[in-house]
């Protein structure tokens, strides 16, 4: 399987909400012995390998934000901890998983990574990640809503944040 990032760049005004999205592609084993561990974290540019460094998102670690479930289940992070930090990660039945960040500030700008680990008994794992950039802008040059730039082409799409 692979992880696709529909958008490689999100440009948002300060104070807005944004949902960063990843999608699981290809054959996904839904067998009883398979578990999926999905998480989000921040990383930094200029590495040899993108997403190899795992930094917290608003002080929440990859383990605080992880989703853990079988191949056929939807899941959400622990609401209390994440929501206190204006965050929520979620996963649906169709391979989409996302992290929603509320009330963006300039400090939220940076590289974000989604990671999926397919885990089988006994403890064998297969890791795949995706990366996207979030730019939070302020002032007269900031867009009124988030603008997203698709990974495959440079056509931009205006979206109204929820």
């Amino acid at each position: 399987f692979k992880v696709a990032t529909p958008y490689s760049l999100y440009v948002c005004p300060e104070g807005q909400n944004v949902t960063l999205t990843c999608r699981l592609l290809g054959p996904v084993d839904k067998g009883h012995d398979v578990t999926f561990y999905k998480t989000w974290y921040r990383s930094s540019r200029g590495e040899v390998q993108t997403c190899s460094e795992r930094r917290p998102i608003r002080n929440l670690t990859f383990q605080d934000l992880h989703l853990h479930h079988g191949g056929h289940q939807a899941a959400n992070t622990s609401h209390d901890l994440a929501q206190r930090h204006g965050l929520e990660s979620a996963s649906d039945h169709h391979g989409n998983f996302s992290i929603t960040m509320r009330n963006l500030t300039l400090l939220d700008s940076g590289l974000y990574c989604c990671l999926v680990v397919e885990i089988r008994h006994h403890h064998s794992e297969h890791r795949v990640h995706g990366a996207m950039e979030l730019q939070v802008q302020t002032g007269k040059d900031a867009p009124s809503n988030c603008v997203v730039y698709p990974s495959s082409s440079q056509d931009s799409e205006n979206i109204t944040a929820a």
Epitope: G31, H32, D33, T35, Y37, Q49, S52, R54, F62, Q63, H66, H68, G70, V117, I119, H121, H122, H123, E125, R127
Partner: antibody, heavy 120, light 111 residues
Framework: DVQLQESGPDLVKPSQSLSLTCTVT?????????WHWIRQFPGNKLEWMGD???????NYNPSLKSRISITRDTSKNQFFLQLNSVTTEDTATYYC?????????????WGAGTTVTVSS | DIVLTQSPASLAVSLGQRATISCKAS??????????MNWYQQKPGQPPKLLIY???NLESGIPARFSGSGSGRDFTLNIHPVEEEDAATYYC?????????FGGGTKLEIK
């Protein structure tokens, strides 16, 4: 909160079988990763014995493979340890535990442990 | 089996000072940039309690005076500043290869 509790006999005779139960509350044994048995000998040495996966498949320490069996009862949310042909060397405190994943595998929840003495 | 050798076997540290415990593996416990090494604390009559996973990640609810470092074969648990309640035995554990194994333990006494 996830809680694990071991139960079984305190005393087992040599050559007999040791049977222990781990009762899990607050979490389904079919929803997590793996459920383990670990023992600690009188000198405090810890030994991983084996585990049962949420799917029911098992994995054992090769040093015990000929004597050990781990099974489960999903309706009661329990898993079991059977160790055959015990000797005095099997005297130990037996723990059940759950493992978890976070770019390492680790035991995040343990039972309080039950001490089993093998003696005639 | 991967053998984990802890040192020292015991140590006594004054209140407020630093305790350093070493764990050396007989082979690398790294995979894809991560170290499959964990640290536990055990007090008499209690089960081991997870402190650090993946060599350096602090388990939720564990005080920040505990920290872990290392990669490959060499790992360290640091406690600073040491408090009275830290008197316990500390174990390292690897999960890179079956069978999972534990170190022999380090007993920490507070002076």
């Amino acid at each position: 909160d996830v809680q694990l509790q071991e139960s079984g006999p305190d005393l087992v005779k040599p050559s007999q079988s040791l049977s222990l139960t781990c009762t899990v509350t607050g979490y389904s044994i079919t929803g997590g990763y793996n459920w383990h048995w670990i023992r600690q000998f009188p000198g405090n040495k810890l030994e991983w014995m084996g585990d049962i996966h949420k799917s029911g498949s098992t994995n054992y320490n090769p040093s015990l493979k000929s004597r050990i069996s781990i099974t489960r009862d999903t309706s009661k949310n329990q898993f079991f340890l059977q160790l055959n042909s015990v000797t005095t060397e099997d005297t130990a405190t037996y723990y059940c535990a759950r493992d978890y994943y976070g770019f390492s595998w680790y035991f995040d929840v343990w039972g309080a442990g039950t001490t089993v003495t093998v003696s005639s | 089996d991967i053998v984990l050798t802890q040192s020292p076997a015991s140590l006594a540290v004054s209140l407020g000072q630093r305790a350093t415990i070493s764990c050396k593996a007989s082979q690398s416990v790294d995979y894809d940039g991560d170290s499959y090494m964990n640290w536990y604390q055990q007090k008499p009559g209690q089960p081991p309690k997870l402190l650090i996973y993946g060599a350096s990640n602090l388990e939720s609810g564990i005080p920040a005076r505990f920290s872990g470092s290392g990669s490959g074969r060499d790992f360290t648990l640091n406690i600073h500043p040491v408090e009275e309640e830290d008197a316990a035995t500390y174990y390292c554990q690897q999960s890179i290869e079956d069978p999972w194994t534990f170190g022999g333990g380090t007993k920490l006494e507070i002076k």
